[in-house]
């Protein structure tokens, strides 16, 4: 799947209206200087690919973000504005049900969420450049 056929304006609107607020709430209590993240994405579909990677897949310090409010809203937004996206998620939902529930220490995930904020900001910037 690639994100080429998504409605990027609608995704931007959803991000600015809700997802961004949830990400900032998750990061509350941290300073922007706490994480030295150099994240980049080259265009709008690529930004969404990177966002998909870091929102719904484990990394070494953060086992899962999928149940966080911003992740649920991200999934809903992509399902709504990216044709065919929902079909890619069926196996993932089934796989998640089989998986053991694991306790995640929130602060271990802060760096990754900081990376996500950077990716979303780049997504918005690439959108502005195209207009």
């Amino acid at each position: 799947y690639d994100f080429t056929n998504c409605d990027f304006q609608k995704i931007e609107a959803d991000y600015l209206r809700t997802i961004s607020k949830d990400l900032i709430t998750y990061m509350s209590g941290t300073k922007s200087t706490d994480f030295n993240n150099t994240v980049s994405c080259s265009n709008r579909p690529h930004c969404l690919t990177e966002i998909q990677s870091l929102t719904f897949n484990p990394t070494p310090r953060c086992a899962s973000l999928a149940k966080e409010m911003f992740a649920r809203k991200t999934k809903a937004t992509l399902a709504l504005w990216c044709p065919g996206y929902s079909e890619t998620q069926i196996n993932a939902t089934q796989a998640m049900k089989k998986r053991r529930k694991r306790k995640v220490t929130t602060n271990k995930c802060l760096e990754q969420v900081s990376q996500l904020l950077g990716l979303w900001r780049r997504f918005i910037r690439t959108l502005l450049k195209k207009q």
């Epitope: 799947y1 690639d2 994240v39 980049s40 994405c41 080259s42 690529h46 690919t49 990177e50 998909q52 990677s53 870091l54 719904f56 897949n57 890619t88 998620q89 069926i90 196996n91 993932a92 796989a95 998640m96 990376q115 990716l119």
Partner: nanobody, 117 residues
Amino acid sequence: EVQLVESGGGLVQPGGSLRLSCAASGSGFGVNILYWYRQAAGIERELIASITSGGITNYVDSVKGRFTISRDNSENTMYLQMNSLRAEDTGVYYCASRNIFDGTTEWGQGTLVTVSS
């Protein structure tokens, strides 16, 4: 489906360096998130490094600053540069490729790294 083959393991002295490679064949490597795992004797396999298609990296605390994960999508290869190796880095290193949408994961067969004087 992606098939993965690791190489580059071996015996190295404490403080030394090694570079592991993970060569992929098949489709899907380009957008998948890639991982290096380590399994020491009697210990559960541990995720130590990850890299997205665009090169965003994350590391477990114990290897941060010493190990560097990288990927070359044109060559379908991932690397793990390991510096300042310690005895506790000994183990079998596995590469893995995970579909970012449905979570299906392919594994390599592993390569043994032994850090000993």
